[in-house]
């Protein structure tokens, strides 16, 4: 083989016979070149008489290898470890669609073994998001979908969402749902979900923030129940009465709509007028009684009190001595059934 420095490498290496094929204790791992920092690839095999790196099918120059050798205490067989550095320039110089790769080849007297291929990529994270979240105004208890497509990057960016700069954890708040395509779903928007939401994309190179989307959770106003009708404006006859309601069930919040319709209702009313009671004329005096008194009466019926009118004041009955204080009537006359009763006389 020919290395990149034009130096010949043997196709096989001599070694003592009867060894097993090399076995890799450590294989090179995929790696990313961040900014201009080269990556180190490591390889360890045993038993191994020689171990070299091959990158993109070409042997790496021997001077590019840092090799260490040790003995396995149990078997006494040689363990070989090798390390190389791959620079950004080397990776950039590889033209074509294929990724830059390296693998280890280890030799023993029984033959060669190849390690896995480790792919080396230049890490980056573009500046602009493919899709940024948009501001939303949603009614209370409704669903919200915020979309985010992070910038292209290698390795692919991880995405997290911030609510007012705090990381959203759907395991802690099950009202949030994160999807594989980086959408954030608010299952039932609460007033406390009114906030600024930011999509954050990050990888080993950088961290990018999307524009912030303000989500406003609003409440449309709702009417309270109607209050009782007010008393009629006129105590007597035709008037008006009204009842009111307020836009407080709930009150509009965060720009929610005010209640539609009237806060006050008016209607005509007629109240029957109260009629105060008045006395009838006094009756004629009664006949003189055994007690030498006569009586007269009247009624609160001219008219009677109506619709809450006042009752008559004064007495129903009036009595007066009918003999000017002399009560000496003939016993017989008073007791004679044939005797005429006393005529009632006027006042």
């Amino acid at each position: 083989g020919i290395d990149s420095g034009g130096q010949a490498l043997p196709d096989s290496f001599p070694s003592a016979p009867a060894e097993q094929l090399p076995h890799f204790l450590l294989e090179p791992e995929d790696a990313y070149i961040v900014k201009n920092k080269p990556v180190e690839l490591h390889c360890r095999a045993f038993p191994a008489t020689q171990i070299y790196f091959k990158c993109n099918g070409e042997w790496v120059s021997q001077k590019g290898h840092v090799t260490q050798e040790s003995l396995d205490e149990a078997t006494g067989l040689r363990i070989r470890e090798v390390q190389i550095e791959v620079s950004r320039q080397q990776v950039e110089e590889l033209f074509g669609l294929e990724d830059y790769w390296c693998q280890c080849v280890a030799w023993s007297s029984s033959g060669t073994t190849k390690s896995r291929r480790a792919y080396i990529r230049i890490a980056y994270l573009r500046k602009n998001f493919d899709q940024e979240p948009l501001a939303k105004e949603v009614p209370l208890d409704h669903e919200v979908l915020l979309q985010c497509r992070p910038p292209e990057g290698v390795p692919v960016a991880e995405v997290e969402w911030l609510k007012n700069e705090d990381v959203i954890d759907p395991a802690q708040d099950t009202n949030f749902l994160l999807t594989i395509d980086h959408n954030l779903i608010i299952r039932q928007a609460r007033l406390s979900d009114t906030a600024n939401y930011t999509c954050v994309a990050k990888n080993i190179v950088a961290k990018r923030r999307s524009t912030t989307a303000t989500v406003i959770v609003y409440v449309n106003g709702g009417w309270s129940s109607w209050a009782e009708w007010s008393p009629c404006s006129n105590r007597c006859g035709r008037g008006w009465q009204k009842r009111t309601r307020t836009c407080t069930n709930p009150a509009p919040l965060n720009g929610g709509a005010f209640c539609e319709g009237q806060a006050c209702q008016k209607t005509a009313c007629t109240t029957v007028c109260p009629v105060d009671g008045a006395w009838t004329e006094w009756s004629k005096w009664s006949a003189c009684s055994t007690e030498c008194a006569h009586w007269r009466s009247r009624e609160c019926m001219a008219p009677p009190p109506q619709n809450g009118g006042r009752d008559c004041s004064g007495t129903l009955l009036d009595s007066k001595n009918c003999t000017d204080g002399l009560c000496v009537l003939n016993q017989r006359t008073l007791n004679d059934p044939k005797s005429r009763p006393l005529e009632p006389s006027g006042d």
Epitope: E143, L145, L177, D181
Partner: antibody
Framework: EVQLVESGGGLVQPGGSLRLSCAAS????????MHWVRQAPGKGLEWVAS????????SYADSVKGRFTISADTSKNTAYLQMNSLRAEDTAVYYC????????WGQGTLVTVSS | DIQMTQSPSSLSASVGDRVTITCRAS??????VAWYQQKPGKAPKLLIY???SLYSGVPSRFSGSRSGTDFTLTISSLQPEDFATYYC????????FGQGTKVEIK
Amino acid sequence: EVQLVESGGGLVQPGGSLRLSCAASGFNLYYYSMHWVRQAPGKGLEWVASIYSYSSYTSYADSVKGRFTISADTSKNTAYLQMNSLRAEDTAVYYCARSYAMDYWGQGTLVTVSS
Amino acid sequence: DIQMTQSPSSLSASVGDRVTITCRASQSVSSAVAWYQQKPGKAPKLLIYSASSLYSGVPSRFSGSRSGTDFTLTISSLQPEDFATYYCQQSYGPFTFGQGTKVEIK
């Protein structure tokens, strides 16, 4: 009260088209994602498509991509599933469901694709 | 797509039994898993969302839990009305459902 009512199912020949409707009441469809899920006779549930009108977001299962189109008319509070190039394997009861939690479902409408 | 492997496919149980149904996601789905109950000729009904949150109106004998990519639905004491088919569903990626578990009377 939240209600979803599907309609538009029926018998159609392979290669034919059908448009399913999902009339929503009791909530504003504009602010919710709506989903179509189907169930072949005697089989399990399979998600078909989703829409979220407010964000102009749509998504489809690979099995229907390019053949089915989900849409919504928010003035009618109705979601639709336009199904073209129908195949025998599309035979199923089609349900519409509300929100990512799929908390409310319609009663379903049967689509039979057969010659 | 993310696969949801549900087990068992069917089970026989008696009223009062404790019943456990499991679902394993083929990759991480966070806690974006829901459980549904379906009776013959009827639409599915939501029982559990976000792996462990009980949906309103669902009896407290139903519960959900998560351990990594394994999700469990437990019915603590089976009632006559619980005999049905149960499905798990993930909503982290494009929605996928488990194959279903039919709970039958022993």
